[in-house]
Structures are given as structure tokens and as C-alpha cells.
């Protein structure tokens, strides 16, 4: 399907002008290639009428132009002095006319209505309010004032100053007669309907001396605003319906094939399940305006959307609406990233979040989508640091791998962590994305002690077991803080027989603190990664207490909760020379220990190859 998008139907009146905007993916090639507007003939060929290279057909000379806006990925065709002959089928497109990078546009030019002389024209959108002004002479001031609607050759009374109101206008019309000296009365009609369209007659007095004024009321369906967004990206519908409906329930709905409108979300708490986890309704401002954000755009999200106000929270005739036509461009600049990430209870997930690579300095945010009411997304962590204290020691946002992607790591998972999370920045809002975390059956792959008590001044070793499948990954220990996880210097012992024959051996990476200080208290993470892509992590809290007995010690079951099936190592700690270690108290060492089996038996499901849109707890 062509990625070019524009208005399907354009209508106007003879003598008027139209402006047609067409959208295209703003790639370098597209920005500089030829843009055209052509008319489809009976033969199927499309004859160029105007192009970005300066060509204008004789039929369009002096009344049309085409302007390219490469920075927006749009071009605009303006046509003036329209005639009935301009009605027809057109294409706006890129490149050569026959190539298919185009969008079909139907233009209909109709004859303007023949109106009596002196007719005042009122053009108003459906659902809005019109005020019809009716002048009269002084002698008709005390006489009856009335508004009639002309239907064919007859006139039907709509309202008069004797308190008559036509049932079709009940509760939405009023006639105002000003104080003395003002020779004009007004009729105000609220919540205009399409059926209100037509010619009206104001009348004051009767007989030959009466005052009359014609008014042509044109009630329009709102012209849908074209919205062009990238697949997997985000769209914001900003809905401003006016103060008159500030206190009325609001909704966003999508027009279906039956031309009715299905509620997507409303302020009464209704939400379409197809948008679960990826839609938020921002509460209204004082002026009654509100906005709806949808992330993770799919091709099937395309269509016509209406926002409106009504006490039922759904579309009703005669209430104000705003319209959009959404096109989802499949030639997306937003990279594919997993929409579902799976982790096991006690384990971890590493979530990749895309952002606009042109905005590397932007603040990065990660929030938890809450569906209650209209939805909120409380901030959990950002690039400046942790925000929610209840995630202390188990949540971190990393700028890596960079160049359009950041990483969020959440460990010590529980079933409560299942849900939808949003990746945001303070920059380009179209790059907001949603990820769902699912907690599945299984065991964490990395095993660390449950908690550790270290003795001031002594040596502390904390083991972290990893299965063979991580033997090729980089292992690390880091100290968690609310601004990140500072990697501790590590010493690589190099390959060994056990490394090569990993199927027979489990492996261990140890953190050594020597000597333990008060500042060492806190959370430590053991993790695996491949380059800048993070995999699983496991967290352990180290408490520091006063020295009771002398001597160095290894973490043993007496002072630490051993990981399941963990073999306890002898208490001797091998000395390693402090060569090229920034902080001589901190280093991580890898030890090979006897195989305890691949303890990831139950967690193989954390990588589900059934969907390219899913990732497990470990990055590939």
C-alpha cells in the first residue's frame, strides 16, 4: 500500500479555492523527489496539472501552485477560481505519475445556492451554536417577532416571541429581544444538527409593513483533520469543543463500516479492549479541552476518529464534535522493539525503549500505565534517577545502548509487576511506546544469596551463579544507587577447560569487598550483557555490621541465604594482585565451580520464539 496520504474527498463551490495537503514519509529521497498533482482520465492515465519542478498546465495557469514542505514530509496544492469542470478524480504523488507512490483524491465542485438578495450566510459546524441577527424598524418594535424555516414553497414557524417553539428545536433555541433603542432581535440555536441546514426567514410585525430578513444556515460536518503517523509510534488527538460543554462527559470514538461510531475511550470509564495498555485520556483543561494519546500504533488503528461531548459519553446528534482521519505509515522510522517482555518471579527483565535518535540529550522516562478511570502513568524512573522509593534496589534506567534506544532493568520481579509500561522522553511525543511485562512460570537463571551481612573491616565475597547458556556473555557486578548502577571493576581470569566444556560445569562470578566499609552497605546487582545489550540481573542487599570476630570470610549459609542448590565454597578467599583496579577494595572475580546443572530448567519459556514482538528476560 502506498505510504502517500491525503484527503479522499474535497468539496467546494464554484469560484472558491481549495488547498489540498498530501503527506509522505520524509526520507531523504522522498524529500527531494518530484511531487505532482494529476488528473485521471478515462484511459486510466494521469495527466500532470502541476508539479514541484515548476510545471503548470495551461488549464491551471495563474490559478494553481504546488509547494513542498520537506521538513514536514508534506506538500500542498492550491487551486483557485474553481469551476464545475474541475470536478473529477485526481492523484497527489511522488516520482513519476504511474509509479504508485500516490493517493487518490476526489474533487467535487458544486454550484453555489441561488439565494434571495440581502441573504446573510451563516456557516457553522454541527453541534455548535449560531446566533441569527434580525433587524426591524421602530414601528415593529412592539409587534410579534418570529423565525421561520423555508421548506420548499412553505414556511414553517420555528420560534416566536409569544413563546412558541417548534418541537424539532425544543430545549436548544431561544429568541432574545433587546432593550429599548436596539432595533435587532436575535435567535440563538444551540447543538446544531445537519437537519437544521437551510434557508430561514426573520420576521417582525405583520402585513405589508412587516420587516423580513433572509438567513442561509449552512451546517457542516467538521472537516476531518488529516493525521499521518508512523507504525509503532504514538498519536495525540487534541479535542477542543468549547466552554459550553466543559462540564459534559467527553469521548473519542472510531467510525466503523456501518457509519456508527464505536467508543474508544470516554471520561465515564469506558475503554475499548483493543487499546488496553496503550491509551490515555488527559483530563480536560479549564476551557474544556482534553487530549487522547494512543501508542504502539497498528495498521488496523487507521480510520476516522471523532471526539465529542455528551452526558452518555458517546456520539449523539447535535452535540459538538471534532474529526480526524488517521493514516498509519508502514515505512516507519520507529524501530521494532518487543511489545511483550516475559520474566519469572524473582527474576528480571531488560526492556528496550526507542527514542528519536536526534534527541540523545532528552530526558528519558519510564512509567506504569494505570487503566483505572481515564488512565494515568505515574513516573517510576527517569534518566536523572529513580523516582518511586518502593522500587529501590530493583529498578534502573540506562542510556545504553544509545543512538535511539535506552534500557530499563527491573528485577526481583513479582506477579504485581505484570502490566503495561510506557517509554517516554521530554522530546518527540510520537516516539512514545508501550511494553507489557508478563510474569511466567520458571526459575531465575542467576542465583545470588537472599541477603548478606558484612562485617566492617573484613573481606566479603558474594557468589553469583550463572548457567552455561550465559558462558559467552559478559558478566558484571554493579552497586545500585538511585541514579544508576555503577559497574565494579572486574578481573577476567580468561578461558579455562570448564569454560570450554560448559555443559559439565556451572559458573560463578564473585564480588569481593576488601575491606568492608560503611559505604559498602546497599544493593548490588549481578548481571549478564552482550556489548551494550543487557540481559538478566539478580539483586542482593548487603548490610554492614560492627566487627565481632577477626579474620576474612566468604559468605556462608550462616550469614547469607544461599541460593537454591548452591554449593557452599570453602571459606578461604584467594588473593588477587590489585593490578589496574581503580578502587583496590572492589573487584569481581570469576570462579569455576562444580556443575549444579543448568538451573534455568523452568525458565526456558522466558524467550518465546512464537512472536517476533516478544522478548524474554534476557536480551539477544
Amino acid at each position: 500500500k502506498s505510504p502517500v496520504f491525503g484527503p479522499q474527498e474535497v468539496s467546494s463551490v464554484e469560484g472558491n479555492s481549495v488547498s489540498i495537503k498530501c503527506y509522505y514519509p520524509p526520507t531523504s529521497v522522498n524529500r527531494h523527489t518530484r511531487k505532482y498533482w494529476c488528473r485521471k482520465g478515462a484511459s486510466g492515465r494521469c495527466i500532470t496539472l502541476v508539479s514541484s519542478e515548476g510545471y503548470v498546465s495551461s488549464n491551471y495557469a495563474g490559478r494553481a501552485n504546488l509547494t513542498n514542505f520537506p521538513e514536514n514530509g508534506t506538500f500542498v496544492v492550491n487551486i483557485a477560481q474553481l469551476s464545475r469542470d474541475d470536478s473529477g478524480h485526481y492523484k497527489c504523488g511522488l516520482g513519476i505519475n504511474s509509479r504508485g507512490l500516490s493517493f487518490d483524491v476526489s474533487l467535487e465542485v458544486s454550484q453555489g445556492p441561488e439565494l434571495p438578495n440581502g441573504t446573510e450566510v451563516y456557516t457553522v459546524d454541527v453541534g455548535r451554536t449560531v446566533t441569527i441577527k434580525c433587524p426591524f424598524k421602530t414601528e415593529n418594535a412592539p409587534k410579534t417577532k418570529a423565525l421561520y424555516k423555508k421548506i420548499g414553497q412553505t414556511s414553517v414557524l420555528v420560534i416566536d416571541s409569544r413563546n412558541y417553539v417548534n418541537p424539532n428545536y425544543k430545549d436548544r433555541i431561544r429568541l432574545r429581544i433587546p432593550g429599548t433603542g436596539q432595533l435587532i432581535f436575535t435567535v440563538v440555536i444551540d447543538r446544531l444538527r445537519l437537519s437544521d441546514h437551510g434557508l430561514y426567514l426573520c420576521q417582525a410585525g405583520d402585513g405589508s409593513n412587516r420587516d423580513e430578513k433572509n438567513a442561509d444556515l449552512q451546517v457542516l460536518e467538521p472537516e476531518p483533520e488529516l493525521v499521518y503517523e508512523d507504525l509503532r509510534g504514538s498519536v495525540t488527538f487534541h479535542c477542543a469543543l468549547g466552554l459550553e460543554v466543559a462540564n459534559v462527559a467527553k469521548f473519542l470514538c472510531r467510525v466503523n463500516s456501518r457509519e456508527t461510531c464505536d467508543v474508544v475511550i470516554n471520561t465515564l470509564g469506558k475503554r475499548d479492549s483493543a487499546f488496553e495498555g496503550r491509551i490515555l485520556l488527559n483530563p480536560q483543561d479549564k476551557d474544556g479541552s482534553f487530549s487522547v494519546v494512543i501508542t504502539g500504533l497498528r495498521k488496523e488503528d487507521e480510520g476516522r476518529y471523532l471526539c465529542g461531548a455528551h452526558s452518555d459519553g458517546q456520539l449523539q446528534e447535535g452535540w459538538p464534535i471534532q474529526a480526524w482521519q488517521l493514516f498509519v505509515n508502514e515505512e516507519s522510522t520507529i524501530p521494532r522493539s518487543p511489545t511483550v517482555v516475559k520474566g519469572v518471579a524473582g527474576g528480571s527483565v531488560a526492556v528496550l525503549c526507542p527514542y528519536n535518535p536526534k534527541e540523545s540529550q532528552s530526558l528519558k522516562y519510564w512509567c506504569l500505565w494505570e487503566g483505572a478511570q481515564n488512565g494515568r502513568c505515574p513516573l517510576l524512573v527517569e534518566s536523572q534517577g529513580l523516582v518511586q522509593e518502593q522500587y529501590e534496589g530493583r529498578l534502573s534506567l540506562l542510556q545504553e545502548p544509545g543512538n535511539g534506544t535506552f534500557t530499563v532493568i527491573l528485577n526481583q520481579l513479582t506477579t504485581q509487576d505484570a502490566g503495561f509500561y510506557w517509554c517516554l522522553t521530554n522530546g518527540d511525543t510520537r516516539w512514545r511506546t508501550t511494553v507489557e511485562i508478563k510474569i511466567i512460570e520458571g526459575e531465575p537463571n542467576l542465583k545470588v544469596p537472599g541477603n548478606v551481612t558484612a562485617v566492617l573491616g573484613e573481606t566479603l565475597n558474594i557468589p553469583c551463579h550463572f548457567p552455561c547458556k550465559f558462558s559467552s556473555y559478559e558478566k558484571y557486578w554493579c552497586k545500585w544507587s538511585n541514579t544508576g548502577c555503577q559497574t565494579l571493576p572486574s578481573q577476567d581470569e580468561g578461558p579455562s577447560e570448564a569454560f570450554v566444556n560448559c555443559d559439565e560445569n556451572s559458573r560463578l562470578v564473585s564480588l569481593t569487598l576488601n575491606p568492608v566499609t560503611r559505604a559498602d552497605e546497599g544493593w548490588y546487582w549481578c548481571g549478564v550483557k552482550q556489548g551494550h545489550f543487557y540481559g538478566e540481573t539478580a539483586a542482593v542487599y548487603v548490610a554492614v555490621e560492627e566487627k565481632k570476630v577477626a579474620g576474612s570470610r566468604y559468605v556462608s549459609p550462616a550469614k547469607a541465604d544461599a541460593a537454591p542448590d548452591e554449593k557452599v565454597l570453602d571459606s578461604g578467599v584467594r588473593e588477587i594482585e590489585n593490578k589496574a583496579i581503580q578502587d583496590p577494595r572492589l573487584f569481581a572475580e570469576e570462579k569455576v565451580v562444580a556443575d549444579t546443572g543448568d538451573q534455568a530448567g523452568g525458565s526456558r519459556a522466558s524467550v518465546d520464539s512464537s512472536s517476533s514482538e516478544e522478548q524474554g528476560g534476557s536480551s539477544k
Epitope: 488527559n282 502513568c377 513516573l379 536523572q384 517516554l424 538511585n482
Partner: nanobody, 131 residues
Framework: QVQLVESGGGLVQAGDSLRLSCAAS????????MGWFRQAPGQEREFVAA????????YYADSVKGRFTISRDNAKNTVYLQMNSLEPGDTANYYC????????????????????????WGQGTQVTVSS
């Protein structure tokens, strides 16, 4: 709710220093930004400085950059404004303000310099700089 109490204001000479404190109590776990604003008689309230409660990133108005320093002590739930090289133009009522972490998408757009971004305010402390 978060309650804020400012202290440290007073009358000083131009060129002198002053340190303002703002003690937060209540639901301090929800704090996101803490800021200082000032309002001179007949003037609009204006941004002075702000600090990110978790990460410690700081923001300053151009008029005070290099002279004022904002800092925090999370353990004491207190934010400080160290004001050096004071000028008569710094005379104003100084207000401490606190902002909750964003929850609604519109909250994410608000900058630490915007008055509308803050949810809680102190009563203010008067700083007078005489020439």
C-alpha cells in the same frame, strides 16, 4: 500532602551571603523537584532555582547563575539555597515549592522552571538586600 517551611531570610548588605532552608514533611516519598521562587512587591513570582529530588540535577534562572547554589539533603528532607554576592535586585519574598512525580501525560511536559508545575508551596521568607 507535603508541608514546606522556609527559614534563613533576613536583612543583609549588598555583596553578602545568605543561606535559605526549606524543610519538607508529610509524604516526602512523592517528591520529584524542589524549587525556589521569589516575588518582589508588585512583581510576578519568578523562578530562581530547582533541584531534582532523586538525581540531584540542578536548574537556575540566568539572573542567579554563578551566585546561587541549590542543594538537598534527602536524609533530612531539606533543600537549601546558598545565595552569594547578593544584590539589591535580589530583595524579595522567597518561596520554597515542591512538585510530585508526573502522573498525567501533560505533567511530563512541564519544566522545573514553570510555576504551574509545582503542587506544594511554603509561606515564604523575606530577603532584603540593602545597598
Amino acid at each position: 500532602q507535603v508541608q514546606l517551611v522556609e527559614s534563613g531570610g533576613g536583612l543583609v548588605q549588598a555583596g553578602d551571603s545568605l543561606r535559605l532552608s526549606c524543610a519538607a514533611s508529610g509524604r516526602t516519598s512523592s517528591l520529584y523537584n524542589m524549587g525556589w521562587f521569589r516575588q518582589a512587591p508588585g512583581q510576578e513570582r519568578e523562578f530562581v532555582a530547582a533541584i531534582h529530588w532523586g538525581g540531584g540535577r540542578t536548574y537556575y534562572a540566568d539572573s542567579v547563575k554563578g551566585r546561587f547554589t541549590i542543594s538537598r539533603d534527602n536524609a533530612k528532607n531539606t533543600v537549601y539555597l546558598q545565595m552569594n554576592s547578593l544584590e539589591p535586585g535580589d530583595t524579595a519574598n522567597y518561596y520554597c515549592a515542591a512538585r510530585r512525580a508526573p502522573e498525567l501525560l501533560d505533567d511530563y511536559k512541564q519544566k522545573p522552571e514553570e510555576i504551574g508545575a509545582y503542587h506544594y508551596w511554603g509561606q515564604g521568607t523575606q530577603v532584603t538586600v540593602s545597598s
